[in-house]
């Protein structure tokens, strides 16, 4: 669809005569008839197949024709067509004299014709005017013409219909050839597909409007490139959706079991060394001078009664000091200046001379010890505490501080490791000499039955089109992560590509 436009510019008829040579009375009141038709090698009369148009009287004899496109569209003359422009044409322009006001062909005498010109040729669609001038013996006509497409028609022959639009069936304007030019943010054959936020993951993200990034199930983040871990995952991460890969020092299905109590809680005091010994279990190795499960108790160095021969012990910042009784000397009052004559043996001890009286030795009665029988027997020296229990002197008595897992006066009783129900997911606990063992129900494994090995929802390969399957361990269901070009809960549906234009 388009318009053949003819711009009449100047008509010269200096003598004011008709084609017959007869003069017009009083002058040639001139109007034009235009016939546009298909190309003819020799332009002949016949139907004006592309259209006709007539003008009113434009002037007398010789005159210039005013451009009147703004005031009614009379000049240029418009010859619209509703077909593909063929690129060739024939044009007949007749100048007629109008004796009266009736310009209909049947109302005019045949000799009212002033001049007739006929041209033919090629004409491409375009904005540029072609200027032409036709001269006969008595007249001259200057004019220009062109073919342009109607609104919304494009292409070399005005055959491509294109209407700009900005709705959900397309976001585009039309190029001169009728092809679509997508508005910013849109793509696709009809510019109906939004361009997602730059960097939005191709498979895991999508969008319904430009610069948006909406995440598919199992993914999160601004660009949908972060997987969502298993629901309830505490100290773990994922590389694919619904995983829970534990951080260092954590274990269990939800990575909520502390396997590195030492690092996470630093329970050992006073510079002691901490060793992990199981879930929420640890052992502190105390530095000298400290005791207690967490080495929280400061141990007096005099508690071990290092001073012999009745020497009295004094604690000092950097150790201890022995104050020796008369007749003794040395770091621990271990050297004697006495002999049996000095009655050095206390608590009924018997004295025996040694080295020809230069030295002596005391034989102590029961419950006493020391080189001078000056010490009551330390009740802890016999290591009465079993199972690695720590013996503590408490005045006349003693007590055992037991290691975890043991109890009783002498730590001789084994606390059942099973008492705290360590086996997860209904596992059965068995006490062993050195710990415990869990017998796991179907679907679970691991030292504490903490690893779920339940029916793998992905085992049946429910996802189509090479999609990736993830098992949601909390519900024993699966999630399919579709490759580009497929959608659906099982990625079973291809995203259709629109067929090409029908034009």
């Amino acid at each position: 669809s388009g318009v053949f436009q003819l711009q009449l510019q100047e008509f010269i008829n200096e003598r004011g005569v008709l084609a017959s040579g007869r003069p017009c009375e009083p002058g040639c009141r001139t109007f034009f008839r235009v016939c546009l038709k298909h190309f003819q090698a020799v332009v002949s009369p016949g139907p004006c197949t592309f259209g006709t148009v007539s003008t009113p009287v434009l002037g007398t004899n010789s005159f210039a024709v005013r451009d009147d496109s703004s005031g009614g569209g009379r000049n240029p003359l418009q010859l619209p067509f509703n077909f593909t422009w063929p690129g060739t044409f024939s044009l007949i322009i007749e100048a007629w004299h109008a004796p009266g006001d009736d310009l209909r062909p049947e109302a005019l005498p045949p000799d009212a014709l002033i001049s007739k010109i006929a041209i033919q040729g090629s004409l491409a669609v375009g904005q540029n005017w072609l200027l032409d001038e036709q001269t006969s013996t008595l007249t001259r006509l200057r004019y220009s013409y062109r073919v342009i497409c109607s609104d919304n028609y494009y292409g070399d022959n005005c055959s491509r219909l294109c209407k700009k639009r900005n709705d959900h069936f397309g976001h585009y304007v039309c190029q001169p050839d009728g092809n679509l030019s997508c508005l910013p943010g849109w793509t696709g054959e009809y510019c109906q597909q939004p361009i997602c936020l730059s960097g939005c993951h191709e498979q895991n993200g999508y969008c319904s409007k430009p610069a948006e990034c909406l995440c598919r199930p199992g993914w999160q983040g601004r660009l949908c490139n972060e997987c969502i871990p298993h629901n309830g995952c505490r100290h773990g991460t994922c590389s694919t959706p619904w995983q829970c890969t534990c951080d260092e020092g954590w274990g269990g299905l939800f990575c909520d079991q502390d396997l590195n109590y030492c690092t996470h809680h630093s329970p050992c005091k006073n510079g002691a060394t901490c060793s992990n010994s199981g879930q929420r279990s640890y052992t502190c190795t105390c530095r000298p001078g400290y005791t207690g499960v967490d080495c929280e108790l400061e141990l007096s160095e005099c508690d071990s009664n290092p001073c012999r021969n009745g020497g009295s012990c004094k604690d000092q910042e950097d150790g201890y000091h022995c104050l020796c009784p008369p007749g003794y000397y040395g770091l621990h009052c271990e050297h004697s200046t006495l002999s049996c004559a000095d009655s050095p043996c206390f608590n009924g001890g018997s004295c025996r001379e040694r080295n020809q009286g230069a030295n002596y030795a005391c034989e102590c009665p029961p419950n006493f010890t020391g080189s001078n029988c000056e010490k009551k027997v330390d009740r802890c020296t016999s290591n009465p505490c079993a199972n690695g229990g720590q013996c503590l002197n408490r005045g006349p008595s003693r007590m055992c501080r037991c290691r975890p897992g043991f109890t009783g006066t002498y730590c001789e009783l084994h606390v059942s490791d099973c008492a705290r129900n360590p086996c997860a997911h209904g596992g059965t606990c068995h006490d062993l000499e050195n710990g415990l063992m869990c017998t796991c129900p179907a679907g679970f494994s691991g030292r504490r039955c903490e690893v779920r090995t339940s029916i793998d929802a992905c085992a049946s390969s429910p996802c189509f089109n090479r999609a990736t399957c993830y098992t949601d361990l909390s519900t024993d269901t699966f999630v399919c992560n579709c490759p580009y070009g497929f959608v659906g809960s099982r990625c079973e549906f291809p995203v259709g590509l629109p067929p090409s234009f029908p034009w």
């Epitope: 219909l161 900005n166 959608v487 659906g488 549906f493 629109p498």
Partner: antibody, heavy 121, light 104 residues
Framework: EVQLQESGPGLVKPSETLSLTCTVS??????????WGWIRQPPGKGLEWIGD???????YYNPSLKSRVTISVDTSKNQFSLKLSSVTAADTAVYYC??????FGGGADLWGQGTLVTVSS | SYELTQPPSVSVSPGQTASITCSGE??????VSWYQQKPGQSPVLVIY???MRPSGIPERFSGSNSGDTATLTISGTQAMDEADYYC?????????FGSGTKVT
């Protein structure tokens, strides 16, 4: 051959919510070439466009009904649905689901057979 | 809101040409579709994008659209063409139907 089939209750009480489902058979709802629309026709009257949706869930509604309409899509079931809340007798109509083709400029080239919904107590 | 106006009815003799108009502001700048609906049946698309015919639609159906008016023309009208005809266009994101024309 692709076919559309509407389903849902034929009678709804005033002030309640009208719910209809359109099942697409013989083809996939998951194509960027189509929008899936709802159109209604009161007895003896003309057609009225309600709204449409694409496979990704982008929805467009008639402004005169927007506050009461929800259209959703379930690609796994190859279905899309219409919910119209707070219905009155004026919502009594034959409800059609249709496929609007992008390459046809949005022309609806495929229609369901329609289902009559009457709003009455 | 955008409105499309159609004559309520058009009468035509068999074999003659029926023309149904649809008018709306600057309608020529929008794509127009035409639907045929026979009693008790669902509508059928007969013209899309002003003048394009879907496959299976007879050549006697043609369309045009310029200015403020779109026209559906049925050349050599047959008895089976008796039906209601609706024009439809998109105004921004909203589908708009004409009021319908009964062709007898």
């Amino acid at each position: 051959e692709v076919q559309l089939q509407e389903s849902g209750p034929g009678l709804v009480k005033p002030s309640e919510t009208l719910s209809l489902t359109c099942t697409v058979s013989g083809g996939s709802i998951s194509s960027s070439s189509y929008y899936w629309g709802w159109i209604r026709q009161p007895p003896g009257k003309g057609l009225e466009w309600i709204g449409d949706i694409n496979y990704a869930g982008s929805t467009y509604y008639n402004p005169s009904l927007k506050s009461r309409v929800t259209i959703s899509v379930d690609t796994s079931k190859n279905q899309f649905s219409l919910k119209l809340s707070s219905v009155t007798a004026a919502d009594t109509a034959v409800y059609y689901c249709a496929r609007e083709d992008v390459k046809f400029g949005g022309g609806a080239d495929l229609w369901g057979q329609g289902t009559l919904v009457t709003v009455s107590s | 809101s955008y409105e499309l106006t159609q004559p309520p009815s058009v009468s035509v003799s068999p074999g003659q040409t029926a023309s149904i108009t649809c008018s709306g502001e600057s309608l020529g700048d929008k794509y127009v579709s035409w639907y045929q609906q026979k009693p008790g049946q669902s509508p059928v698309l007969v013209i899309y994008q002003d003048a394009m015919r879907p496959s299976g639609i007879p050549e006697r159906f043609s369309g045009s659209n310029s200015g403020d008016t779109a026209t559906l023309t049925i050349s050599g009208t047959q008895a089976m063409d008796e039906a209601d005809y609706y024009c439809q266009a998109w105004d921004m994101e909203t589908g708009v139907f004409g009021s319908g024309t009964k062709v007898t």
